[in-house]
C-alpha cells in the first residue's frame, strides 16, 4: 500500500483544482470571513497510527466530497472543474479504502478514534451551517473554498501517520 506517495500526489492535484475554481475576486469577500475552528490543535498534539490516520483522512475527504456534491455547490462552481475535483476526491477515498483492507485485513474494522472523527464532522457541520446562514452566496463559497484549501494543507500530521508502520 503505497499510500503516502499516491495520496500526496492526488492531494496536490485536488488543491490545484480547488485553487482554479475561484470565480470572484476574494478581495471583495473579506467581510464574510468566518472562524470555522478546524481542529488543528487536536491533530497537532497527536501521533497518529496508520489506521487512525487513514480513518480521519477518509472522514475529511468524504465530508469535502459531500460538501461539493450538493446542488448548491453545482450552482456555485464551473461544472468541469467541479467534476474533476470530485473525481480526484473519489479516487482518494478509493485509495484510502483499499489501504484499510490491506492494513488491517478484510475481516477487521480499522481502529477509529471517535473523538477525531467527531471533531471533523462538527467542523464540517459548522461550514454547512455558515453556508446556509449566508444563503450560499458567492462570497460564502469563496470563504469555504479558502477554508477547505487550508484544512487540506493542515492535515500534515495525518500524512505523517500514513508513513508510520503500526
Amino acid at each position: 500500500c503505497d499510500l503516502p506517495q499516491t495520496h500526496s500526489l492526488r492531494n496536490r492535484r485536488a488543491l490545484i483544482l480547488l485553487a482554479q475554481m475561484g470565480r470572484i475576486s476574494p478581495f471583495s469577500c473579506l467581510k464574510d470571513r468566518h472562524e470555522f475552528r478546524f481542529p488543528e490543535e487536536e491533530f497537532d498534539g497527536h501521533q497518529f497510527q496508520k489506521t487512525q490516520a487513514i480513518s480521519v483522512l477518509h472522514e475529511m475527504i468524504q465530508q469535502t466530497f459531500n460538501l461539493f456534491s450538493t446542488e448548491d455547490s453545482s450552482a456555485a462552481w464551473e461544472q468541469s472543474l467541479l467534476e474533476k475535483f470530485s473525481t480526484e476526491l473519489y479516487q482518494q477515498l478509493n485509495d484510502l479504502e483499499a489501504c484499510v483492507i490491506q492494513e488491517v485485513g478484510v475481516e477487521e474494522t480499522p481502529l477509529m478514534n471517535e473523538d477525531f472523527i467527531l471533531a471533523v464532522r462538527k467542523y464540517f457541520q459548522r461550514i454547512t451551517l455558515y453556508l446556509m446562514e449566508k444563503k450560499y452566496s458567492p462570497c460564502a463559497w469563496e470563504v469555504v473554498r479558502a477554508e477547505i484549501m487550508r484544512s487540506f494543507s493542515f492535515s500534515t500530521n495525518l500524512k505523517k501517520g500514513l508513513r508510520r508502520k503500526d
Epitope: G22, C29, L30, K31, R33, V143, R150
Partner: antibody
Framework: EVQLVQSGAEVKKPGESLKISCKGS????????IGWVRQMPGKGLEWMGI????????AYSPSFQGQVTISADKSISTAYLQWSSLKASDTAMYYC??????????????WGQGTLVTVSS | DIQMTQSPSSLSASVGDRVTITCRAS??????LNWYQQKPGKAPKLLIY???SLQSGVPSRFSGSGSGTDFTLTISSLQPEDFATYYC?????????FGQGTKVEIK
C-alpha cells in the same frame, strides 16, 4: 521560521524607476496575500495595496492606484512594489506584510524589515 | 473608504499605569479590527486581531474590546518596553485603513 525579507535601501532621483522586493520563507507563499504599507518620515501607516501570489490578483488603495504596481513571482516566493517615475513625495519607508486572505487567522502577522526609499535631486 | 479615528493622538503615562486607547470607525466594521505596536525604526507588530484576540507571543497585559464602530486597546500595567506608537486598522473591506496612531510617552 516565517520570514519576510525586503531588499535594501534605495536612493533615487525624481523621474527614475524602481522595483523593491519582499521574499517570503518558512511558509507556503501562495497561501497568504502580501500587502504593502507606506510610512512617510514622522508619519503614520498608509495601506497601499495587496496581491494574492497564487494568481497575481491585485487590489490598490485609491490613493495609490496608477502610482505604483504590485506584482509577485510565486516561483521564487517574492512580491514586488514598483514605480515607473519616482517623485520626491515617494520618499518613505515601505513595508510588506503577509495576510491570511479569506482564512480566519491573524491579519498582517509577519512584516518585512522595511525598505527605505529616498528620492532626491 | 472607512475612516479610522484614534484618540488620544498622544498620552504620557508612568510604568504600572493602566492605559486605554480608543478607535472609532466611520461605519460598522463588526469585529474586524486589528491593533499594532510600532517602535522607532522598527516594523509594526500585531498585538490584537479580530478586536479582542491576543496574537501569539503578546503579553496578556494587552487586551482589546469593542464591536461595530467603537473599539478599545487596554494595557493593564504599562511596562518600560510598551512606550511606542499604537495603530488600529479596519480589516472588513478594501482599502484597509489605519488610525492616525497614538504615541505613548513616558511621563
Amino acid at each position: 521560521e516565517v520570514q519576510l525579507v525586503q531588499s535594501g535601501a534605495e536612493v533615487k532621483k525624481p523621474g527614475e524607476s524602481l522595483k523593491i522586493s519582499c521574499k517570503g520563507s518558512g511558509y507556503s507563499f501562495t497561501s497568504y496575500w502580501i500587502g504593502w504599507v507606506r510610512q512617510m518620515p514622522g508619519k503614520g501607516l498608509e495601506w497601499m495595496g495587496i496581491i494574492d501570489p497564487s494568481d497575481s490578483d491585485t487590489a490598490y488603495s485609491p490613493s495609490f492606484q496608477g502610482q505604483v504596481t504590485i506584482s509577485a513571482d510565486k516561483s521564487i516566493s517574492t512580491a514586488y512594489l514598483q514605480w515607473s517615475s519616482l517623485k520626491a513625495s515617494d520618499t518613505a519607508m515601505y513595508y510588506c506584510a503577509r495576510h491570511p486572505g479569506l482564512n480566519w487567522a491573524p491579519d498582517f502577522d509577519y512584516w518585512g524589515q522595511g525598505t527605505l526609499v529616498t528620492v532626491s535631486s | 473608504d472607512i475612516q479610522m479615528t484614534q484618540s488620544p493622538s498622544s498620552l504620557s503615562a508612568s510604568v504600572g499605569d493602566r492605559v486605554t486607547i480608543t478607535c472609532r470607525a466611520s461605519q460598522s466594521i463588526n469585529r474586524f479590527l486589528n491593533w499594532y505596536q510600532q517602535k522607532p525604526g522598527k516594523a509594526p507588530k500585531l498585538l490584537i486581531y479580530a478586536a479582542s484576540s491576543l496574537q501569539s507571543g503578546v503579553p496578556s497585559r494587552f487586551s482589546g474590546s469593542g464591536s461595530g464602530t467603537d473599539f478599545t486597546l487596554t494595557i493593564s500595567s504599562l511596562q518600560p518596553e510598551d512606550f511606542a506608537t499604537y495603530y488600529c486598522q479596519q480589516a472588513i473591506d478594501l482599502p484597509f485603513t489605519f488610525g492616525q496612531g497614538t504615541k505613548v510617552e513616558i511621563k
